[in-house]
């Protein structure tokens, strides 16, 4: 029986041209985990696995960058990183968990209602 | 200024599909998401989820995967909502609500349509 | 999912009065970065509902400044200071900080 739990950064709101860290912790599990693949929507961003350590998809190599831990590193943010991540946990025995993040990247100029943007 | 202007009331029978629109004006229609509510029996309210017009990007609610598809079409601003394989479950007041920059929050809402399954 | 509870669920209350609806989530909604992605509602009958607050505290455009809203974590409060008839309708409190996002299952604030 799966009784693990994902917990995530939460939303992010950040501005073009910062960066930004996501994150996520599986819990209450003492499953194993064995590899942590990152995706947005349906592109593999990274992969961090228990035995090879990581991969980074070449298409992000740039803006992408491992850790901390188990997280990603977004980096140079562009309106069109705004959307929806996914941290997939692989585990054994229990199998798949799934935690989800939304990112919005805003215009630096957008510093709307006084907005208190996300730049580490 | 901003408004969302939704598509009528509809009576729909159950197993149909109906699609939604929410045309929007007054603003930069691109640059912000348009999220999706559900009110069911005039009470409470639920997050359907959000498309942003962008990129295309969305996120729902898994509640309402496979039962809600949203997409956009940039040359009219306009948003639509498709529900699948209609039930009673699914008679509710559904909203287009434009997102808040920076906050996650909802702004500016449609007037709502009405959604009502019978046969 | 967050789980999102108000209370109470019906507050009658006299055109002058102070009130106060309370929000509580089951899991802290303060993001990695120390935002907190709450905000409130008002739905009056017959209209769309309108954003009241946001970012917990945060007063929206044309919002009268009757209307506060305060807390962290996991706790929140909306405070309307002099109660008057355009006030009266349900109020929601929705979470943004975790997907899905969720509301508060609405408080009727209604005459006495």
């Known amino acids: 029986m799966m009784t693990g739990t994902i917990e995530t950064t939460g939303n992010i709101s950040a501005e073009k041209g910062g960066s930004i860290i996501l994150q996520c912790h599986l819990s209450s599990t003492t499953a194993q985990v064995t590899q942590v693949n990152w995706e947005q929507q349906d592109q593999l961003l990274a992969i961090c696995n228990a035995d090879l350590g990581w991969h980074i998809s070449p298409s992000f190599k740039d803006r992408v960058a491992p850790g901390p831990g188990l997280g990603l590193t977004l980096q140079s943010l562009t309106v069109n990183d705004t959307g929806e991540y996914f941290c997939i946990y692989h585990t054994y025995p229990d199998g798949t968990y799934t935690g989800r993040i939304f990112l919005e990247v805003l215009e630096s100029s957008v510093a709307e209602h006084g907005a208190r943007f996300q730049i580490p | 200024e901003v408004q969302l202007q939704q598509s009528g009331p509809e009576l729909v029978k159950p197993g149909a599909s109906l699609k939604i629109s929410c045309k929007a004006s007054?603003?930069?229609?691109?640059?912000?998401?348009m999220n999706w509510v559900k009110q069911s029996h005039g009470k409470n309210l639920e997050w359907i989820g959000l498309i942003f017009p962008y990129n295309g990007a969305t996120s729902y609610n898994q509640k309402f995967q496979g039962k809600a598809t949203l997409t956009v079409d940039k040359s009219s601003n306009t948003t639509y909502m498709e529900l699948l394989s209609l039930t009673s479950e699914d008679s509710a007041v559904y909203y287009c609500?434009?997102?808040?920059?920076?906050?996650?929050?909802?702004?500016?809402w449609g007037q709502g349509t009405s959604v009502t399954v019978s046969s | 999912d967050v789980v999102v509870t108000q209370t109470p669920l019906s507050l009658p209350v006299s055109f002058g009065d102070q009130v106060s609806i309370s929000c509580r989530s089951s899991q802290s909604l303060a993001n990695s970065y120390g935002n907190t992605y709450l905000s409130w509602y008002l739905h009056k009958p017959g209209q769309s509902p309108q954003l009241l607050i946001y970012g917990i505290s945060n007063r929206f455009s044309g919002v009268p400044d009757r209307f506060s809203g305060s807390g962290s974590g996991t706790d929140f409060t909306l405070t309307i200071s002099t109660i008057k008839p355009e006030d009266l309708g349900m109020y929601y409190c929705l979470q943004g900080t975790h997907l899905p996002w969720t509301f508060g299952g609405g408080t009727k604030l209604e005459i006495k």
């Open positions: 609500t434009r997102g808040l920059r920076g906050y996650f929050a909802l702004d500016y």
């Open positions: 007054g603003y930069s229609f691109t640059g912000y998401t």
